[in-house]
């Protein structure tokens, strides 16, 4: 490589300057325009509308001189709506009369089709606790829960666990503060990512895997309403409810003793397929070693705030970084795959599809995934979720950005860290990190309350810019958080994952685990191997820092040893000990299942809050297994084997 | 074919009230929204009023709220325009204009009707 | 209130190409649509979302928007285009027109 020499070198300064300077004169709001205009739009996964957008971002990516660009097919199978309407009736017990309330004009996809009738209990946000609070049993009665807090798929589980016989949805005036009360919206209740009739493994056509089904799948029906439905419904139930859920006014709690409420649903399943575009910049030192820049395409409504700003700012994002490469020199070490991604709308089926594919060799190649949708949902605060490996590219980028409107710099606390919210199931985020173990990141500009039209017929361009009339501004800035996140994790010879964070994470777990030493003393267990785990982490976190700064910055071969043991970290958080198929989302951390330490804290108190319900002999193999995964993230950040002490 | 066909425009003093109508046809009348655009004599259009497709929302320009109420029956396919306390600056063509689908949220008056003349005078 | 600027009058000659701008505050921002009306008719809409020709609209006719902004371009003039043109934007729930232009052909 004799032309090394004639590229002047580039630092930090010199590309956080260009990437700004090229965002200024980017025009944001005209490609999310364009993103909703009539031939694009609505653009349901697998439509002609979604596959019109396919071709165009493909083009995009082509016209942008990409090292390469593709696509992966996948044939999943979805649930849509029938042509026999879904529907919600009031009964009377005796069936002496009936009063359609709705056929609503929305749907959850992947509802289990029945029809079911009995009283109506509402139960809040359909958490956990909420139902715990109910004083109301809700076993063989259906339930209505209002939209937002945590996903549709999670309320179902819920109630589903509560022995409800079905689930109804809407959005209230207090929380959802839209106009008109007849609008109709969408989700799905699959509590998992990807196709659920191959859980754990990838839809690609010439894949003949025996039939299968996700056991996050629902077995109760569930439907959204209107708010106008609810209302009606309202009207035929009693008692106020709690003034601590701070909702509408017409809130009631429970069907009048002569009432009943029947939902039939009726949804079918259908084969579709769906393109997922790539394209690639690689890079100049170690191409197979790249970053993943991803949106979500696909959109049950018009999508402007769901799927046209994230896959604004991934063109935009493609363009800005193949200038910078291709017309002013900038040499990224490590590869950028730029990717659009459909199905999202069904649970990131195609993200979550394509780590499906690559599941033995993805995580040892890319090393970060930044999710840019619903990038842009306000102004006022900027929040994010991610892994703790990426908390100080993170703090520094945040130290870096101005905010759009304020000026001031994005990092106004320094205990954001503390304040950081888990990734969940609805974000693209979620299987990246908690079921291929590839530390990612997702964020966005947004306000204190939801933005409330996601999801809903309503979220159209024109919405969003009169609810953001800076929208140009505030996508910039986001373009600008995800580009500096992209230079500085291609660009630096030493990997930007901070392993060390994960220290922190250990001894938070540890302190809270120890609250219950007595327990465990009791049970004649000793926490004693997990601290040497423990230690063994952060012994090696420090000898990884210590070989970091003994070892020459030019030596190439040196630091992609370094970089590939740092690159493995999130990897090991994978437990071992559970198949990817039952548990896809291993992550001991953010993962989901009994093999989780929040699992293992949750199961643990019930020794002394509901003891029949403890399973000491699960416990013990939970502690087991922790600790030795803890351990083997240990060894793995040690290096080599004969490096390793044995003493454990 | 869609069609719209208004009626009820003439003479009434200021102060008066008169009501308008636009019989529909040739499409689903309740799943779109429907407008009122006036024209007065030698000027350009001005936008008076909006309806939902359900009726349950509607809009109006400042210069007729509080006097103009805009109403439909989705059941006779036909809109209405109630006005009162006529002024002389209400003098125009009214026109009652579909408001199409637009994926964007920006919804183009996409068929119009041939107008009604309603004068204001003493 | 949000308002739209038209010029009063365009003329052209026929075959030569006409172009009418709409101005307003951000304009580009927002979808903007126009409208053709010819004497003793009532308007009819030629262009949506900024460019979109419906059914039946000769391909002469053509519009852009950005900026501040909107353009109405009927390329080929013909003595059937003389007419007065409105443009037309959303804002917020209620909806605002230019105040036309007069197309003469000459």
């Known amino acids: 490589k004799d032309d090394d020499d004639k590229v002047p070198q580039l630092y930090w300064d010199d590309l956080k300057k260009m990437l700004s300077e090229k965002l200024d004169t980017t025009d944001f709001t005209s490609t999310i325009k364009l993103l909703n205009e009539n031939s694009y739009v609505p653009r349901e996964a697998g439509s002609q509308k979604d596959e019109n957008l396919a071709w165009y971002i493909e083009n995009q990516f082509r016209e942008c001189k990409l090292s390469k660009v593709w696509r992966d097919e996948h044939f999943v199978k979805i649930q849509v709506k029938d042509s026999a309407q879904n529907s919600v009736t009031i009964t009377g017990t005796n069936s002496e009369f009936v009063y359609l309330v709705e056929n609503p004009g929305g749907y959850v996809a992947y509802s289990q089709n029945a029809t079911v009738t009995g009283k109506l209990v509402h139960a809040n946000f359909g958490t956990e606790k909420d139902f715990e609070d109910l004083d109301s049993p809700v076993n063989g009665s259906l339930v209505i829960v209002r939209a937002g807090k945590i996903t549709f798929a999670e309320k179902v589980a819920n109630a589903e666990s509560a022995n409800a016989i079905g689930v109804l949805i809407y959005m209230d005036k207090t929380k959802f503060p839209i106009v008109d009360a007849d609008v109709s919206f969408f989700g799905h209740a699959h509590l998992g990512t990807g196709d659920p009739y191959t859980p754990g493994f990838p839809s690609f056509n010439h894949t003949q895997f025996p039939p299968s089904r996700s056991s996050g799948l629902p077995n109760i029906p569930v439907q959204t309403i209107s708010r106008a439905a609810a209302e009606r419904l309202f009207e035929n139930m009693e008692g106020d409810c709690p003034s601590d859920w701070k909702t509408d006014s017409s809130c009631r709690m429970v069907t009048s003793q002569n009432k009943s409420v029947k939902l039939s649903v009726s949804n079918v399943m259908k084969e579709i397929k769906i393109l997922n575009i790539f394209g690639v910049i690689k890079g100049f030192v170690e191409p197979d070693r790249y970053v993943v820049v991803g949106a979500q395409r696909d959109s049950w409504g018009p999508g402007a705030a769901k799927s046209s700003v994230g896959t604004a700012l991934l063109l935009e994002l493609a363009q800005t970084f193949s200038d910078m490469v291709l017309k002013d020199g900038f040499q990224p070490s490590r590869s950028i795959v730029f990717a659009s991604w459909s199905a999202g709308d069904f649970g990131s089926v195609g993200a979550t599809e394509w780590l499906e594919g690559y599941l033995s060799s993805l995580h040892l190649k890319a090393f970060t995934f930044i999710n840019l949708d619903k990038a842009v949902l306000g102004t006022s605060n900027f929040r994010v979720s991610a892994s703790p490996l990426l908390y100080a590219l993170i703090e520094k980028t945040m130290q870096e950005v101005k905010h759009p409107v304020t000026g001031l710099s994005l990092y106004q606390d320094s205990n954001w860290a503390s304040k950081v919210e888990k990734l969940t199931f609805d974000n693209a985020a979620f299987p990246f990190l908690a079921y291929s173990g590839i530390p990612a990141v997702s964020f966005c500009f947004c306000e204190d309350t939801d933005y409330p039209y996601l999801g809903t017929t309503m979220d159209t361009y024109k919405e969003l810019i009169e609810k953001i009339p800076q929208l140009n501004k505030v996508a910039r800035a986001a373009a600008e958080v995800a580009g500096q996140f992209m230079i500085k994790l291609t660009h630096d010879v030493e990997l930007n994952l901070d392993y060390e964070r994960y220290n922190s994470q250990l001894l938070s777990f540890l302190r809270n685990l120890n609250q219950y030493r007595a327990d465990i003393r009791e049970m004649g267990l000793s926490l004693q191997w997990l601290y040497s785990a423990r230690g063994d982490f952060f012994r090696a976190t420090s000898r990884l820092t210590t070989d970091f700064k003994n070892s020459e910055k030019t030596d190439r071969f040196v630091m992609k040893e370094l970089n590939d043991r740092v690159m493995k970290v999130e990897y090991y958080f994978l437990s071992p000990y559970v198949s990817p198929r039952e548990s896809p989302f291993r992550h001991i951390f953010w993962g989901s299942g009994s093999h989780t330490l929040s699992a293992l804290l949750e199961h643990l108190k019930l020794r002394k809050t509901n003891n029949r319900a403890f399973n000491e002999t699960l416990f013990r193999n939970q502690l087991a297994l922790a600790t030795w995964t803890i351990q083997g993230a240990a060894n793995a950040l040690s290096g080599d084997i004969w490096d390793i002490d044995n003493e454990f | 074919e869609v069609q719209l066909l208004e009626s009820g425009g003439g003479l009434v003093q200021p102060g008066g009230s008169l009501r308008l109508s636009c019989a529909d046809s040739?499409?689903?009348?309740?799943?779109?929204?429907m407008n009122w655009v006036r024209q007065a004599p030698g000027k350009g259009l001005e936008w008076v009023s909006g309806?939902?497709?359900?009726?349950?929302?509607?809009y109006y320009a400042d210069s007729v709220k509080g006097r103009f109420t805009v109403s439909r029956d989705n059941s006779k396919n036909t809109l209405y325009l109630q006005m009162n306390s006529l002024r002389a600056e209400d003098t125009a063509v009214y026109y009652c204009?579909?408001?199409?689908?637009?994926?964007?949220?920006?919804?183009?008056?996409?068929?119009w009707g041939q107008g009604t003349q309603v004068t204001v005078s003493s | 209130s949000y308002e739209l600027t038209q010029p009063p009058s365009v003329s052209v000659s026929p075959g030569q190409t006409a172009s009418i701008t709409c101005s307003g505050d951000?304009?580009?921002?927002?979808?903007a649509c126009w409208y053709q009306q010819k004497p003793g008719q009532s308007p009819v809409l030629v262009i949506y979302?900024?460019?979109k020709r419906p059914s039946g609209i000769p391909e002469r006719f053509s519009g852009s928007n950005s900026g501040n902004t909107a353009t109405l371009t009927i390329s080929g003039t013909q003595a059937m285009d003389e007419a007065d043109y409105y443009c037309?934007?959303?804002?917020?729930?209620?909806?605002?027109f230019g105040g036309g232009t007069k197309l003469t052909v000459l």
């Open positions: 951000k304009l580009g921002d927002k979808y």
């Open positions: 309806i939902s497709g359900s009726g349950g929302h509607t």
């Open positions: 979302q900024d460019s």
């Open positions: 037309q934007a959303w804002d917020s729930s209620t909806v605002v």
């Open positions: 040739g499409f689903t009348f309740s799943s779109y929204a």
């Open positions: 204009a579909r408001e199409g689908y637009d994926s964007s949220g920006y919804n183009p008056f996409d068929y």
